[in-house]
């Protein structure tokens, strides 16, 4: 029973950081503007993955894709890269995991099958977690870089009384969605690779008894297996399982006014 | 077509209050920011704030905060300012304009006067 | 506040003359973003509300006539009427769109001769 419900909130809580890691791609807001030192803006910018967008205080909202590939910051595409490779590995272990459910009978699946399974959507997971977390902290890093690199520029170009400032940008709502997501992913993930211990079929050791025999040296086993020759051989015995349901006696493992002057 | 219309001419007392209105018509009112503008005569103009009739917000010029309060009446598709503590610096034609898309005013009211006089 | 300096503060031309007015603002009004100048021009007849001619610094308002031109970017901005009418007779002013709060020009008066 514990096992089951390990896989089962390991899946649930894979699918829901799959969402978010999706959700978080599709996102525009991975980096908004600084508004610290310029709160009076009329015109506020804000920028994804995939495209940027202008929203005025109007409430209009324009929004303008990268329609260049080469132009882009190699950073970006490997930002991009990172979230979808997160995106496919995530969709293709849930594929798995789905069939890998032990609530879930197709045909006459073996548990060892449902174990590999399992362990594979978990590793799954796991690297699509990863994936997120790196293609997130990239693009935070970047914009670190960024942000302290444009108030080190603040008001170049000052002459006279005329100030030209630099727009600069901080962590959107994106970056937080992705590091959550990720983490959830991951935790999922982890979760499916515990469940898949619990699943395997038990190894386990019978001490043999040893009878002996005159003229003959053979070890006999109980539990009906085969015996196997070899004084005092220490040879492990799997159990054989009949398909039908069985007891687990693992522990189970447990979300404006504004006023300006 | 759009129209926005406003209340006549008012004639106050100093340290008195005054609520101007501006009705819209021809327009999906709750979607666009309503601005107000001051006019003082023979002088330029003046921006005081900016109401969403749709959920209320306001944004005000730290000059006209705590003097105008701007409301809306989305059942009768009308914005009010009122201006309290009126001295004969307030005396000007007020404006009320729709504010679109590029942050700019497209139609204005014809103006409403208000006179603070004793 | 962002400060709009307009010159001249007023001009007279003759019907068919070319006029050119300049704006400048104490802060830069182009987004980085999206590349546009938050700047807009309004015509003010007398007795009449200000008129939308310009947003965006150089998009026309729909129903005004070609003969109205904006231009610049950053801080220096100019409407030009390349052939005077006399409806044209009116206060034009400048206004920064870009920053809280909005802050107008003084305007430039036009005078026909």
């Known amino acids: 029973m514990a096992v089951t419900a390990c896989q089962g909130l390991g899946f649930v809580v894979s699918l829901i950081g799959i969402a978010g890691i999706i959700a978080a791609t599709c996102m525009d807001q991975w980096s908004t503007q600084d508004l610290y030192n310029n709160p009076v803006t009329a015109v506020f910018n804000y920028q994804g993955l995939w495209r940027s967008c202008v929203r005025e205080s109007s409430g209009f909202t324009e929004c303008r894709g990268y329609f260049t590939l080469l132009g882009l910051p190699a950073m970006l595409q490997a930002v991009r890269a990172l979230m979808i490779v997160g995106i496919v590995l995530g969709a293709i272990g849930l594929l798995v995991s789905i069939f890998a459910l032990k609530c879930i009978r197709i045909g006459s699946m073996e548990d060892s099958a449902k174990a590999n399974m399992t362990l594979t959507s978990g590793i799954m997971f796991i690297v699509s977690g990863l994936c997120a977390i790196a293609g997130v902290s990239v693009f935070a890093n970047m914009l670190v870089t960024n942000f302290w690199m444009s108030t080190a520029n603040m008001y170049t170009g000052m002459g006279g009384m005329v100030q030209t400032v630099q727009t600069r940008y901080t962590f959107g709502a994106a970056l937080f969605v992705g590091w959550v997501a990720g983490g959830l992913t991951l935790i999922g993930g982890v979760m499916m690779c515990i469940a898949c211990r619990g699943l395997a079929p038990e190894e386990t050791n019978y001490k043999a008894v040893s009878y002996h025999a005159s003229g003959h040296s053979v070890a006999y086993k109980p539990g009906g297996f085969k015996a196997s020759t070899g004084f005092g051989s220490n040879t492990k015995n799997k159990k054989i399982y009949d398909g039908g349901a069985r007891t687990e006696d693992e522990v189970q493992s447990y979300p404006s006014k504004h006023d300006y002057v | 077509q759009v129209q926005l219309q406003q209340s006549g001419a008012e004639l106050v007392r100093p340290g008195s209050s005054v609520k101007i209105s501006c009705k819209a018509s021809g327009y999906a009112f709750s979607s666009y920011w309503m601005n107000w503008v001051k006019q003082r005569p023979g002088q330029g103009l003046e921006w005081i704030g900016q109401?969403?009739?749709?959920?209320?917000?306001?944004t005000y010029n730290g000059k006209f905060k705590g003097q105008a309060t701007l409301t809306a009446d989305k059942s009768s598709s009308t914005v009010y300012m009122q201006l309290s503590s009126l001295t004969s610096e307030d005396s000007a034609v007020y404006f009320c304009a729709r504010f679109v898309k590029g942050n700019a005013m497209d139609y204005w009211g014809q103006g409403t006067s208000v006179t603070v006089s004793s | 506040d962002i400060v709009m300096t307009q010159s001249p503060s007023s001009l007279s031309v003759s019907a068919g003359e070319k006029v050119t007015m300049s704006c400048k603002s104490s802060q830069s009004l182009l987004n980085s973003g999206n590349q546009k100048n938050y700047l807009a021009w309004y015509q003010q007849k007398p007795g009449q509300p200000p008129k939308l001619l310009i947003y965006g610094a150089s998009t026309r308002e729909s129903g005004v006539p070609d003969r109205f031109t904006g231009s610049g970017s950053g801080t220096d901005f100019t409407l030009t009427i390349s052939s005077v009418r006399a409806e044209d007779l009116a206060v034009y002013y400048c206004?920064?769109?870009?920053?809280?709060?909005?802050?107008f020009g003084s305007g430039t008066k036009l005078e026909i001769k």
């Open positions: 109401i969403y009739p749709g959920n209320g917000d306001t």
């Open positions: 206004q920064n769109d870009h920053y809280y709060p909005f802050t």
